[in-house]
C-alpha cells in the first residue's frame, strides 16, 4: 500500500503561520482573517522509522507540490531546505533520512526533530516575517514548538 498522507497546517507557539517566501523558502508571520488562506498546507506522510507514543516519523511535503522539507549540510551546518522531488516516486514509505522528521508531542508542545541531525529542530524566529530554519537549540530565543491543525483533503 502507498504511504498514508494527511493535510495539515502548522503554527508556532506565538501563533505565527507559515507561508511561502519565494519558490524554495518558508517564512513565519502572524496572519488574520482572509490572509489565513496564504498559509502553507502540508501533506504530512507517516513514514518508516523508529516510533513511540510521543514520537512519530513523518515527512512534510507541500500539498499538491513536489516539494519536501529536507535537512542537509551546508557549509558544515545542518540546514533546512525545500527540495524538489520526482512526483512519480514521492511520497513513499521509506523516505530518505534527510526528509524524515520525528514529530514529538509532549505536554501540549509539538516539535519536529530532524532524523538526519538529532537535536536539530524546525524553528522560527521571534521576529516577524523571518525564514523557517533548522535550529540546534531548544528553550532559547528561537521557537521550536508548534501546534498542528489537520484539514480535510
Amino acid at each position: 500500500a502507498p504511504v498514508r498522507s494527511l493535510n495539515c497546517t502548522l503554527r508556532d507557539s506565538q501563533q505565527k503561520s507559515l507561508v511561502m517566501s519565494g519558490p524554495y523558502e518558508l517564512k513565519a508571520l502572524h496572519l488574520q482573517g482572509q490572509d489565513m488562506e496564504q498559509q502553507v498546507v502540508f501533506s504530512m506522510s507517516f513514514v518508516q522509522g523508529e516510533e513511540s507514543n510521543d514520537k512519530i516519523p513523518v515527512a512534510l511535503g507541500l500539498k499538491e507540490k513536489n516539494l519536501y522539507l529536507s535537512c542537509v549540510l551546508k557549509d558544515d551546518k545542518p540546514t533546512l531546505q525545500l527540495e524538489s522531488v520526482d512526483p512519480k516516486n514521492y511520497p513513499k514509505k521509506k523516505m530518505e533520512k534527510r526528509f524524515v522528521f520525528n514529530k514529538i508531542e509532549i505536554n501540549n508542545k509539538l516539535e519536529f526533530e530532524s532524523a538526519q541531525f538529532p537535536n536539530w529542530y524546525i524553528s522560527t524566529s521571534q521576529a516577524e516575517n523571518m525564514p523557517v530554519f533548522l535550529g540546534g537549540t531548544k528553550g532559547g530565543q528561537d521557537i521550536t514548538d508548534f501546534t498542528m491543525q489537520f484539514v480535510s483533503s
Epitope: 508531542e105 501540549n108 508542545k109 501546534t147 498542528m148
Partner: antibody, heavy 119, light 107 residues
Framework: EVQLVESGGGVVQPGRSLRLSCSAS????????MSWVRQAPGKGLEWVAY????????YYPDTVKGRFTISRDNSKNTLFLQMDSLRPEDTAVYYC????????????WGQGTLVTVSS | GIQMTQSPSSLSASVGDRVTITCRAS??????LTWYQQTPGKAPKLLIY???TLADGVPSRFSGSCSGTDYTFTISSLQPEDIATYYC?????????FGQGTKLQIT
C-alpha cells in the same frame, strides 16, 4: 476497566452555546488521542472533533469548523467540546471516543450525552 | 472526501445463519477500514480494524475481508446477541467517514 462518561448535554436554542465534558478513567488519559463522534436521532455516525494526546493537534470537519472547539485537561483526565452558534442540525447524541487521526479508529466509547437544539 | 456506501441498509436472518455486509469505498483506502457494532440504545463498539484484524475480546464468528475497494463483514453463525446496527468507517484520508449502517434483525 476503561470508562468514558459524558456530561453537559441538554436543550439549547439555536445560536447559543453548550460545553460538553468527558471524564476518563481506567487508562493513562495523557497517552491517548481523543475524539467526539455524534449521532443524530435515527441516523448514522459523524466524527466532529479530534485532539492529540498532548493537545497540540486538532481536527474538525467542515460541518463544525469555526463553531466547535475541542480541548483537554490531562491533569484532570477530562475532554471538552465547546459548541458555539449551535444549529438545529447539531441535534444528536455526542459520544466521547478514544482514538483519532493517527490510529484512525475508535476503540473505546462513552455512553453519550444528548444535545437538542430547538427554539 | 472518500464516501462509504454500505449495503444492505437492513437485513433479517435466522440464528445460525451466515450473514454478510458490504462496504464500498469511492476510492482506494488500502485496508484502512474499521467495523463497529451498535446495539440498541448503546454506544458503538469496535469489532474489526485494518479491514480484518479482530479487536480484543471479539468472538471469532466475526471476520472481515476485502477485494479492491469492496470490504466485507461476515458473521459466520448468527447469535441472538448480534441484533444490532453495523457500521464501517475508513481512515485513509480526512475526513474519516462512516457508512450509513446496516440494521440486522433476527427472523
Amino acid at each position: 476497566e476503561v470508562q468514558l462518561v459524558e456530561s453537559g448535554g441538554g436543550v439549547v436554542q439555536p445560536g447559543r452555546s453548550l460545553r460538553l465534558s468527558c471524564s476518563a478513567s481506567g487508562f493513562i488519559f495523557s497517552r491517548y488521542d481523543m475524539s467526539w463522534v455524534r449521532q443524530a436521532p435515527g441516523k448514522g455516525l459523524e466524527w466532529v472533533a479530534y485532539i492529540s494526546h498532548g493537545g497540540a493537534g486538532t481536527y474538525y470537519p467542515d460541518t463544525v469548523k469555526g463553531r466547535f472547539t475541542i480541548s483537554r485537561d490531562n491533569s484532570k483526565n477530562t475532554l471538552f467540546l465547546q459548541m458555539d452558534s449551535l444549529r438545529p442540525e447539531d441535534t444528536a447524541v455526542y459520544y466521547c471516543a478514544r482514538g483519532g487521526v493517527y490510529k484512525g479508529y475508535f476503540d473505546e466509547w462513552g455512553q453519550g450525552t444528548l444535545v437538542t437544539v430547538s427554539s | 472526501g472518500i464516501q462509504m456506501t454500505q449495503s444492505p441498509s437492513s437485513l433479517s436472518a435466522s440464528v445460525g445463519d451466515r450473514v454478510t455486509i458490504t462496504c464500498r469505498a469511492s476510492g482506494n483506502i488500502y485496508d484502512y477500514l474499521t467495523w463497529y457494532q451498535q446495539t440498541p440504545g448503546k454506544a458503538p463498539k469496535l469489532l474489526i480494524y485494518n479491514a480484518k484484524t479482530l479487536a480484543d475480546g471479539v468472538p471469532s464468528r466475526f471476520s472481515g475481508s476485502c477485494s479492491g475497494t469492496d470490504y466485507t463483514f461476515t458473521i459466520s453463525s448468527l447469535q441472538p446477541e448480534d441484533i444490532a446496527t453495523y457500521y464501517c468507517q475508513h481512515f485513509w484520508s480526512l475526513p474519516y467517514t462512516f457508512g450509513q449502517g446496516t440494521k440486522l434483525q433476527i427472523t
